[in-house]
Amino acid sequence: EINGSANYEMFIFHNGGVQILCKYPDIVQQFKMQLLKGGQILCDLTKTKGSGNTVSIKSLKFCHSQLSNNSVSFFLYNLDHSHANYYFCNLSIFDPPPFKVTLTGGYLHIYESQLCCQLK
């Protein structure tokens, strides 16, 4: 299911990098979140629960990430103009069932003031 544009601030700039915020409902217990740049998978994070409610976090395509009870943040560093693109949060929900996939995204504009190592 494609939901289109994120209805929240998806990109947070700091120190020449960007935090890309991928939100999900807090009822969701087990999921995979992928960060897509265009159609390419940049990062992913999978959260599963084992016996005794032990939480497992795995990444096949590792990026610096941060998990909360309703969001995954992916961090991109050393921004340059090539980072400008459409970015999508691709959420696959495993629990609660049934399996659902939802895609939200937005365009990352890169301005001079946000670049990492701008010449003075």
């Epitope: 299911e1 939901n3 994120a6 209805n7 929240y8 939100k23 999900y24 409902p25 807090d26 009822i27 969701v28 309703n70 959420l91 929900i93 609660p96 069932p97 049934p98 399996f99 659902k100 996939v101 939802t102 939200t104």
Partner: antibody
């Protein structure tokens, strides 16, 4: 009012098989998660099985390994293959559909808002 | 498995009276609860979803409330066609999806 139409019920001996079907032409079938729910005469409702829009399947413990749910979206149809039937499977079987929509931090569940009229399965020798 | 308990098992009231039906869940199901009405020989009909949202075509005299583990279905003024069996159902912690045992609403 949207209608689902079940068929395939009947009398079968213990250990036998039946295939139930459920069809509609009146709503966007492929956007619904579909379920089978059964009811013994004079008793309550018991969930049997479900299939999600992505084809993911779920079963109650009482039918796991004996029943198989499937769907054919191009035909707006739902099926339940019932094998190794037991007397305890005797019931009216309803097909029903519900929807879950995820948008950002919102998880909407709209309930089982479409139902068929039911088809009777009797397992007896 | 989430167990749903409904009470009372039978409720005897007269047309025009207010009916209050209760459903209790064995664990927190937030607001992911639905209510169904079933008449003899008919399929169940969805009345309320998300604990408090009326389904399409359901009269305003039906209302739902509650969250977590305790839920209520209220019929503000009973009509003759409201006498039936009412079931609550959860579909957030599953499989299995579970239904309550039902409350029979009968004419006094």
């Amino acid at each position: 009012e949207v209608r689902l139409v079940e068929s395939g019920g009947g009398l079968v001996q213990p250990g036998g098989s039946l295939r139930l079907s459920c069809a509609t032409s009146e709503f966007i079938f492929n956007s619904y998660d579909m379920h089978w729910v059964r009811q013994v005469t004079g008793k309550g409702l018991e969930w049997v099985s479900a299939i999600g829009t992505a084809g993911d399947t779920y079963y109650s413990d009482s039918v796991k390994g004996r029943f198989t749910i499937s769907r054919e979206d191009a035909r707006n149809s739902l099926y339940l293959q019932m094998n190794s039937l037991r007397a305890g499977d005797t019931a009216v079987y309803y097909c029903t559909g519900d929807r879950t929509v995820v948008r950002g931090v919102n998880y909407y569940y709209y309930g089982m808002d479409v139902w068929g009229q039911g088809t009777t399965v009797t397992v007896a020798s | 498995e989430v167990v749903l308990t409904q009470f009372p098992a039978t409720l005897s009231l007269s047309p025009g009276e207010r009916a209050t039906l209760s459903c209790r869940a064995s664990q927190n199901i937030r607001s992911y609860l639905a209510w169904f009405q079933q008449k003899p020989g008919q399929a169940p009909r969805l009345l309320i979803y998300g604990a408090s949202n009326r389904a399409t075509g359901i009269p305003a005299r039906f209302s739902g409330s509650g969250s977590g583990t305790d839920f209520t279905l209220t019929i503000s003024s009973l009509e003759p066609e409201d006498f039936a069996v009412y079931y609550c159902q959860q579909r957030i912690s599953w499989p299995p999806i579970t239904f309550g045992p039902g409350t029979r609403l009968e004419i006094k």
